[in-house]
């Protein structure tokens, strides 16, 4: 099923299993179960770090309720400006009934543009990546991640939001796409298929991978997600393909082993902190980058997508667990939660490495059809 060019030294070749300390089994809700009455020094009195599944629904921001139980934890959070700018809070409280963007699903009515007009935009995601047409940009430097190694406490919320499984990340996970292009990680979630059916969102020369991880980030230039939506570079997503390998991936197992606890739509559990970077490929220097959108409503554009060239390997059993454990809306299995690829409409995908150079002996001269734009600006 893999394309001939998927070798160790070719685009998207070679997996990274990502190791982390094995951590003990966990209990149900703890750390940030409910809005906090008092936050740590330097933080406003805001609700605790909250969900933002998928690149999913933008919540309507509601005032903090006096009753902790009255708030619904959902979807793309709004990050409030904290008392100290260094530590944002992911504030995703909203009432489900009050948000039209909660009423969407994969493969059916209502059409997404009716849910959010931006879904009919010209520069949408995901896209098909054709390495031969990618513009090699030497200015694209290795990604820098800081603070992605988390101790087991505080625990993190893992939630089945009906569209994906999402891990809400605490403040302090910093990512740089390059000088002056700094972001804070908010959440990560996965997209997958079904038995024998791959479910990555992005494709490579038409090839769909078994699954895909997205780590969603907010630019440090913005205090809140709703301020950043639709603004160029306001949000950035790191994406990596997951494919089958011979061994169990211990980093992913820390999440996959907990999926049975959240099989039901809307359920959540708490998992020990882990090395978030171990969920990503080890090679931060080779990637594709383009400007697109959120892949779920509200489909806001201006999102910088960084798709790793290297894949992450999970065992066959792990991929099966991912695609066959969770339930979505209407007593249906949560499967095939990916959006169809969208037209580039003139966009050029950039590569941090010469992805267009074919390793076969036929290519005497590297074929690079697109030139690098102002990468790194």
């Amino acid at each position: 099923q893999r394309l001939p060019r998927m070798q160790e030294d070719s685009p998207l070749g070679g997996g990274s299993s990502g190791e982390d300390d094995p951590l003990g089994e966990e209990d149900l809700p703890s750390e940030e179960d409910s809005p906090r009455e008092e936050d740590p020094p330097g933080e406003e009195d805001l609700p605790g770090e909250e969900d933002l599944p998928g690149e999913e629904d933008l919540p309507e921001v509601k005032p903090k309720s006096e009753e902790e139980g009255s708030l619904k934890l959902e979807d793309l959070p709004t990050v409030e400006a904290p008392g100290d700018p260094q530590e944002p809070q992911n504030n995703a409280h909203r009432d489900k009934e009050g948000d039209d963007q909660s009423h969407w699903r994969y493969g059916g009515d209502p059409p997404w543009p009716r849910v959010s007009p931006a879904c009919a935009g010209r520069f949408q995601s995901p896209v098909d990546i054709r390495p031969q047409l990618a513009a090699f940009c030497p200015a694209l430097r290795p990604l820098e991640l800081l603070g992605f190694q988390l101790p087991p406490l505080p625990e993190l919320r893992l939630r089945n939001n009906g569209h994906s499984v999402q891990l809400t990340l605490p403040p302090g996970l910093e990512m740089a796409l390059g000088p002056g292009r700094e972001y804070r990680a908010l959440q990560l979630h996965l997209h997958w298929g079904a038995a024998g059916r791959p479910g990555s969102e992005h494709t490579v020369e038409g090839h769909r991978f078994p699954a895909e991880i997205h780590v969603v980030h907010l630019s440090t230039a913005f205090a809140r997600v709703d301020e950043a939506l639709g603004r160029p570079g306001g949000l950035a997503v790191l994406a990596a393909f997951l494919e089958e390998g011979p061994e169990e991936n211990s980093a992913y197992e820390q999440l996959l082993s907990r999926l049975e606890e959240i099989a039901e739509e809307g359920s959540e559990t708490q998992v020990p902190g882990l090395d978030i970077s171990a969920l990503l490929p080890s090679d931060f220097s080779r990637y594709f980058q383009y400007e697109g959108s959120l892949t779920t409503p509200p489909c806001a554009q201006g999102v910088i997508w960084t798709v790793f060239n290297q894949t992450v390997m999970l065992s066959a059993k792990q991929l099966h667990t991912l695609s066959d454990t969770l339930w979505g809306p209407g007593d249906s299995r949560l499967q095939l939660n990916f959006r169809a690829t969208q037209p580039l409409n003139g966009r050029v995908i950039e590569a941090s490495f010469p992805a267009g150079v074919d390793s076969s002996p036929r290519a005497a001269e590297p074929v690079q059809l697109n030139s690098c734009l102002a990468a790194g600006d």
Partner: antibody, heavy 118, light 111 residues
Framework: QVQLQESGGGLVQPGGSLRLSCAAS????????MSWVRQAPGKGLEWVSA????????YYADSVKGRFTISRDNSKNTLYLQMNSLRAEDTAVYYC???????????WGQGTLVTVSS | QSVLTQPPSVSGAPGQRVTISCTGS?????????VHWYQQLPGTAPKLLIY???NRPSGVPDRFSGSKSGTSASLAITGLQAEDEGDYYC???????????FGGGTKLTVL
């Protein structure tokens, strides 16, 4: 405002037991992991044990594993440390501390002194 | 012997700048875990001074700053004041020990 108040310290013989308590107020107790940190007289800080907000996960320093048990009662906003088989080297001021989302300890109690001596 | 190594003491005159180092290993600071700093004034409980390597809680003067590089971290104090005198501790998490670890502490003396 956040307040943590330890109690239960005192003089105990080697091999004896003691139960420390930490009463918390001013924040949603069940939403935070908590830890015990100790400081022997004239010495530095040593992390002893930690517990998740639900109480479902517990962690211990090697020096106390099998002898100390951390627990919490979220309905009473109280953290506990049950100390058994106490040794002279357990003599210290014991602080309870709240876990910050970054992995540090953002609020500390004033401490309670535990003296293990015959 | 502490997992994180700090100098036992540092000193400086009022108004001066001092730095306190904290050296770890590839299983703690070098692994990427956050470093935090605490101030313990004589006879009092420790107080969080810097969290997440570089961040100051509200109420902590900007004379205090933290940095981290490789397997070590540093706390810098500028414009030294008499009331800064006390013990300073660094702290991180160690994946080999599966434990939260502290430095041995540094006694700051304001001359």
């Amino acid at each position: 405002q956040v307040q943590l108040q330890e109690s239960g310290g005192g003089l105990v013989q080697p091999g004896g037991s003691l139960r420390l308590s930490c009463a918390a107020s001013g924040f949603t107790f069940s939403s935070y992991a908590m830890s015990w940190v100790r400081q022997a007289p004239g010495k530095g800080l040593e992390w002893v044990s930690a517990i998740s907000g639900s109480g479902g996960s517990t962690y211990y320093a090697d020096s106390v594993k099998g002898r100390f048990t951390i627990s919490r009662d979220n309905s009473k906003n109280t953290l506990y440390l049950q100390m058994n088989s106490l040794r002279a080297e357990d003599t210290a001021v014991y602080y309870c501390a709240r876990s910050h989302s970054s992995g540090g300890f953002d609020y500390w109690g004033q401490g309670t002194l535990v003296t293990v001596s015959s | 012997q502490s997992v994180l190594t700090q100098p036992p003491s540092v000193s400086g005159a009022p108004g001066q700048r001092v730095t306190i180092s904290c050296t770890g290993s590839s299983s703690n600071i070098g692994r990427g875990y956050n470093v935090h700093w605490y101030q313990q004034l004589p006879g009092t409980a420790p107080k969080l001074l810097i969290y997440g390597n570089t961040n100051r809680p509200s109420g902590v003067p900007d004379r205090f700053s933290g940095s981290k590089s490789g397997t070590s971290a540093s706390l810098a104090i500028t414009g030294l004041q008499a009331e800064d005198e006390g013990d300073y501790y660094c702290q991180s998490y160690d994946s080999s020990l599966s434990a939260w670890v502290f430095g041995g502490g540094t006694k700051l003396t304001v001359l």
